[in-house]
Structures are given as structure tokens and as C-alpha cells.
């Protein structure tokens, strides 16, 4: 169960994924562009669940972009109320975590738009959630190139 | 809308289920809580079920209350071993993603009464 | 489970006044809190989420703020109407952490 909730989306600016000032950080769009962002060697892997980072990129890069996404992934916390905070987890379960709570968010607009009621009180919606399933899909694309072995946590 | 029902007036020891019934949307589209409130006291949750019908319970409330869905539109609540210190008005509240979970539609609650 | 502190237990002010509400938890829930306001009778009503966005319908009198263990809710510009108890509520559900505060007793003079 999971969904999102605040204002307009806004980008992520740089690889540090900080979100612009003065914008609320809760919309799922900036969660999907922020691993979108630094992952995009690793969305690149499409060739199965069980491949490999590209050969493409020597060590230093490995090493840059895994910083990167640890600093992604420590703003997610803020973003996805699903995210365990008070124990370790892999980035696996973390991009599982994500999607859950996207899927969460897509029930909670679907069964919106029958009724017309958001969160049940007549409320408009509040964030660009009609472009979730794209997202969806984005982060499921993702989370399959991430080795399943993979235990790199996040704290 | 959500509505609760089932409360009464029960003895020490014995069972009660109380059913929560929501119209105008499917309890697979968002994640449904229980919370109870002693007369003159404060708000206590009990425990939350998931769009995907995962149940949570506070600490307190495990392995003695136990909630599962029995339709696309009601839940129960069992609650077993009941004590006089069980005596409160029972509300069933929807969450919402969007508010981070929190409880946006609550019932009138349902009144329990454990009395010998 | 999580332990979540208000204070004051109750509190009283006059109308047009300000009232605040403070909340702490006994660990970081990041930002993960709820406010709402119950009247006798009545079921509870949210007021905040995400510790400080407003729920639509709110009046911008109420506003919420802090993160991690130490969360405020303000009321200024006191209204008869505010006259109510007020809970905050963790709602961490990657913790599964949903406990309520005590609960504060506003009493607007």
C-alpha cells in the first residue's frame, strides 16, 4: 500500500537528487526521475535479470554511480512513507518498496476517478498521478536490472 | 462511506467480531485500520490491513485481535479474551497513500461493552 | 511499538489567541506524522499529514511542522469552533507504526 501524495511534481536537479527548494518532495514523480537519473547504467541492462552492470563502465564509474544512487536512495525515505527506516535493506527490496507504494497510489487514483472523491472527502488530486503507469513500468524495468543478488544496503 | 457494526454489551472471556462496512469503493484500493477509544480517553490503533490484505497490529493487540477481510466491501475484527479493560467506542478508518497513510474516512464507531 | 509523547495533556486560550501542541516520538519517523481533531461524539478528522501538508479543507490557521522525533502543531487565530482534542499519530507504514499520541484538550475561551 502505497501512495503519494503533495503538490506538482517538480525535477530533480543533478546527480545529488536534491529536490528544488520550496517544492514538496512527495510527489511519485520525483522518486521515478530520481532513480531514473542515477540509474541510467543500469536501465541500460535490459538484457535479463540476472545481467551485470555494462562492461562498458570500469570501476570508478561502478563506484560513482552507486554513490550517487545511495544519496537517491536516502531521499526516497522522505518521498515513500514504505520505506523501512529502522533497519537495513537491499536495494532491491527498496525499488520493491517503491513500486508497492506507486501501486498503492494508482488503486487510490483509479478508485477516485469512479467515485470522484479523493481520499474520500471531494478532495481534488493534489499530484500528476495519471502518469503512473508509465512510471510504473519505468521502475519495474529497473528493479529487474538490479542483480538479485545484490546487498548493498542502505541505511 | 464506512460504517461499523457488531458492538455489544458481552461478558469477560467471551469473543466478539465486529464488521466494517465501506460503500462507494473496494477495500483492495486502500489500506483499512482499526482504532478504539476507551469512554473519556485517548485514540488506540489496533492494527491495519494493505491493499493486498497483509495485516499489521500494534504490539499490544497481537495474537488476541485479528483482522481479515470477508468481501470486497467488509472486513471483521475478532477479538478474543476480552476484559473489562476492552470497554470502547471501535472505529474503522480508511488510509490513504496519498495523505501518507493516514486515516482520511472513519466510521461513527461501534460501541463495546465488556461487563460481567 | 513506538511511543508517541503530546504535551500539553490540555491547554487554554483565549479566541484569537495561538495554541501550540508539540509531539515527540520516541524514535525518528522522519516525517511521517499525522494530526487530527476529534469533538465529543464525533470521529476523528485529519487535519495534517506528512507532518505539515494541510489537508484540503483546512483552514490555513492550522500548521504543522518538525521531523524525525519532534513534531509541532500550531493554531493561531484561535476559533470557538477549535475548541477540541487534538492527536497527532505516527504513520509509518514501513514500520507499521500507527500510534496516537495522548491526545490534547484545546479549550478556547
Known amino acids: 500500500m502505497k501512495v503519494a501524495s503533495g503538490s506538482t511534481a517538480t525535477a530533480a536537479a543533478g546527480p545529488s537528487c536534491a529536490l528544488k527548494a520550496g517544492k514538496t518532495a512527495s510527489g511519485a514523480g520525483e522518486v521515478v526521475r530520481c532513480l531514473s537519473e542515477q540509474s541510467v547504467a543500469i536501465s541500460r541492462c535490459a538484457g535479463g535479470a540476472g545481467a551485470r552492470l555494462p562492461a562498458l563502465l570500469d570501476e570508478q564509474q561502478v563506484n560513482v554511480l552507486l554513490y550517487d544512487m545511495n544519496g537517491c536512495y536516502s531521499r526516497l525515505k522522505e518521498l515513500v512513507p514504505t520505506l523501512p527506516q529502522n533497519r537495513k535493506v537491499s536495494k532491491v527490496e527498496i525499488l520493491q518498496h517503491v513500486i508497492d507504494y506507486i501501486r498503492d497510489l494508482q488503486l487510490e487514483l483509479n478508485s477516485e476517478s469512479e467515485v470522484g472523491t479523493p481520499g474520500g472527502r471531494g478532495l481534488p488530486v493534489r499530484a500528476p498521478l495519471s502518469t503512473l503507469n508509465g512510471e510504473i513500468s519505468a521502475l519495474t524495468a529497473e528493479a529487474a536490472c538490479v542483480p538479485a543478488d545484490d546487498r548493498i544496503l542502505c541505511r | 462511506s464506512v460504517e461499523e457494526s457488531g458492538g455489544r454489551l458481552v461478558s469477560p472471556g467471551t469473543p466478539l467480531t465486529l464488521t466494517c462496512t465501506v460503500s462507494?469503493?473496494?477495500?483492495?484500493?486502500?489500506?483499512m485500520g482499526w482504532v478504539r477509544q476507551a469512554p473519556g480517553k485517548g485514540l488506540e490503533y489496533i492494527g491495519i490491513?494493505?491493499?493486498?490484505?497483509?495485516t499489521y497490529y500494534a504490539d499490544w493487540a497481537k495474537g488476541r485481535f485479528t483482522i481479515s477481510k470477508t468481501s470486497s466491501t467488509t472486513m471483521d475484527l475478532k477479538m478474543t479474551s476480552l476484559t473489562t479493560e476492552d470497554t470502547a467506542t471501535y472505529f474503522c478508518a480508511r488510509g490513504a497513500a496519498s495523505r501518507f497513510y493516514a486515516f482520511t474516512l472513519w466510521g461513527p464507531g461501534t460501541l463495546v461493552t465488556v461487563s460481567s | 511499538d513506538i511511543v508517541m509523547t503530546q504535551t500539553p495533556a490540555s491547554v487554554e486560550a483565549a479566541v484569537g489567541g495561538t495554541v501550540t501542541i508539540k509531539c515527540q516520538a520516541s524514535?525518528?519517523?522522519?516525517?511521517?506524522l499525522a494530526w487530527y481533531q476529534q469533538k465529543p461524539g464525533q470521529p476523528p478528522k485529519l487535519l495534517i499529514y506528512r507532518a505539515s501538508t494541510l489537508e484540503s479543507g483546512v483552514p490555513s490557521r492550522f500548521k504543522g511542522s518538525g521531523s524525525g522525533t519532534e513534531f509541532t502543531l500550531t493554531i493561531s487565530d484561535l476559533e470557538c469552533d477549535d475548541g477540541a482534542t487534538y492527536y497527532c499519530?505516527?504513520?509509518?507504514?514501513?514500520?507499521?507504526?500507527?500510534?496516537f499520541g495522548g491526545g490534547t484538550e484545546v479549550v478556547v475561551k
Open positions: 524514535e525518528s519517523i522522519i516525517n511521517r
Open positions: 490491513m494493505s491493499t493486498s490484505g497483509s
Open positions: 462507494g469503493f473496494s477495500l483492495s484500493s486502500f489500506p
Open positions: 499519530q505516527a504513520t509509518d507504514y514501513g514500520d507499521s507504526y500507527f500510534t
